[in-house]
């Protein structure tokens, strides 16, 4: 089990590092987006795992951004985010495979309404229970 957890961490960290770099290979990214969305978590250790991903980064002082799958919809009344988060999530759930371009990548400020827990604990718990 420890080996499995290590392998999972390595895969996730690699997925985060390479997020958005290859529009033809988005299966791992979309799977991880789905995990974050479902487990209500962000990043592996912490949301800050995402801050090195250049494609998500804002300019200057607004650098810290995370994927929209980290957005905590229940913590906000902001309906505009529904179009950006919920609909893409639903299309992925329906396996509507399509190549994604960097312009399609949805990011939100990490200081807003996001999940502040990393996903490691939730996934480890899930592994222990299965």
């Amino acid at each position: 089990r420890a080996q499995l957890e290590r392998s999972l961490r390595d895969v996730v960290e690699k997925t985060i590092q390479k997020y958005g770099t290859n529009p033809e290979e988005t299966a791992a990214e979309e799977s991880w987006d789905y995990v974050q969305f479902q487990l209500r978590c962000c990043g592996w250790h912490y949301p800050q795992d995402w801050f090195q991903v250049l494609i998500l980064r804002g300019n200057g002082s607004e650098a810290h951004r995370v994927p929209c799958s980290c957005y905590n919809l229940s913590a906000t009344n902001d309906s505009t985010i529904l179009d950006k988060v919920i609909l893409p999530q639903l299309s992925r759930l329906g396996h509507l495979a399509r190549s994604r371009h960097s312009a399609d990548i949805c990011a939100v400020p990490a200081e807003s309404h996001i999940y502040r827990e990393g996903c490691a604990q939730g996934l480890q718990k899930w592994l222990h229970n299965n």
């Epitope: 912490y46 800050q48 801050f51 090195q52 002082s61 810290h64 400020p109 200081e111 807003s112």
Partner: antibody, heavy 115, light 107 residues
Framework: QVQVKESGPGLVAPSQSLSITCTVS????????VSWVRQPPGKGLEWLGV???????NYHSALKSRLSIKKDHSKSQVFLKLNSLQTDDTATYYC?????????WGQGTLVTVSA | DIQMTQSPASLSVSVGETVTITCRAS??????LAWYQQKQGKSPQLLVN???NLADGVPSRFSGSGSGTQYSLKINSLQSEDFGTYYC?????????FGGGTKLEIK
């Protein structure tokens, strides 16, 4: 443009509580974090805590038991409360826009803890 | 909590010189690091975040580098307005800390 301004009591007696208000403009408290930092006279910076856009907080682990940060969106204000003050809590207290890196700082308010 | 160790504590340099200030974290902070400049009697100002990303309006003579536990701030061709105290700050985990500061004085 972004503005951040602290207002505090100046002098507080030992064992009493400190309350400081940070009034902000030029950005929304729903999408930005606001942090608190203090600096004792002639010393370095000490991070105290942050309140995020969703109202959740992170606190300095050694101060967690006597520190609280809250906010009022309608007034664009963030509040710091520090209980059971001692003389070593004497410092300039700053609030700043930003939860991770702190992009805009207030001018600070000097708080002296003395009988 | 993660400790941040800055060095040197102070240095005396001339205008036009290049200086490097370093910051060591007690554990891997994965580039979640900011640098600030503070002048006497003033509030700190953000220079760099995410270890290498220059904040808005910061001159290009400033640059940040590093990864893991070791980070540095380099100032090329020092100007008179660059003198003051510099602080690093990490934001990995759930509680942040500042380094002890580096006082940059005019020679």
């Amino acid at each position: 443009q972004v503005q951040v301004k602290e207002s505090g009591p100046g002098l507080v007696a030992p064992s009493q509580s400190l309350s400081i208000t940070c009034t902000v403009s030029g950005f929304s408290l729903t999408t930005s974090g606001v942090s608190w930092v203090r600096q004792p006279p002639g010393k370095g910076l000490e991070w105290l805590g942050v309140i995020w856009g969703d109202g959740s907080t992170n606190y300095h682990s050694a101060l967690k038991s006597r520190l609280s940060i809250k906010k009022d969106h309608s007034k664009s204000q963030v509040f710091l409360k520090l209980n059971s003050l001692q003389t070593d809590d004497t410092a300039t207290y700053y609030c700043a826009k930003g939860g991770y890196s702190l992009a805009h700082w207030g001018q600070g308010t000097l708080v002296t803890v003395s009988a | 909590d993660i400790q941040m160790t800055q060095s040197p504590a102070s240095l005396s340099v001339s205008v036009g010189e290049t200086v490097t200030i370093t910051c060591r974290a007690s554990e891997n902070i994965r580039s979640n690091l900011a640098w600030y400049q503070q002048k006497q009697g003033k509030s700190p100002q953000l220079l760099v975040n995410v270890a290498t990303n220059l904040a808005d309006g910061v001159p290009s003579r400033f640059s940040g580098s590093g990864s893991g536990t070791q980070y540095s701030l380099k100032i090329n061709s020092l100007q008179s307005e660059d003198f003051g105290t510099y602080y690093c700050q990490h934001y990995w985990g759930t509680t942040w800390t500042f380094g002890g500061g580096t006082k940059l004085e005019i020679k």
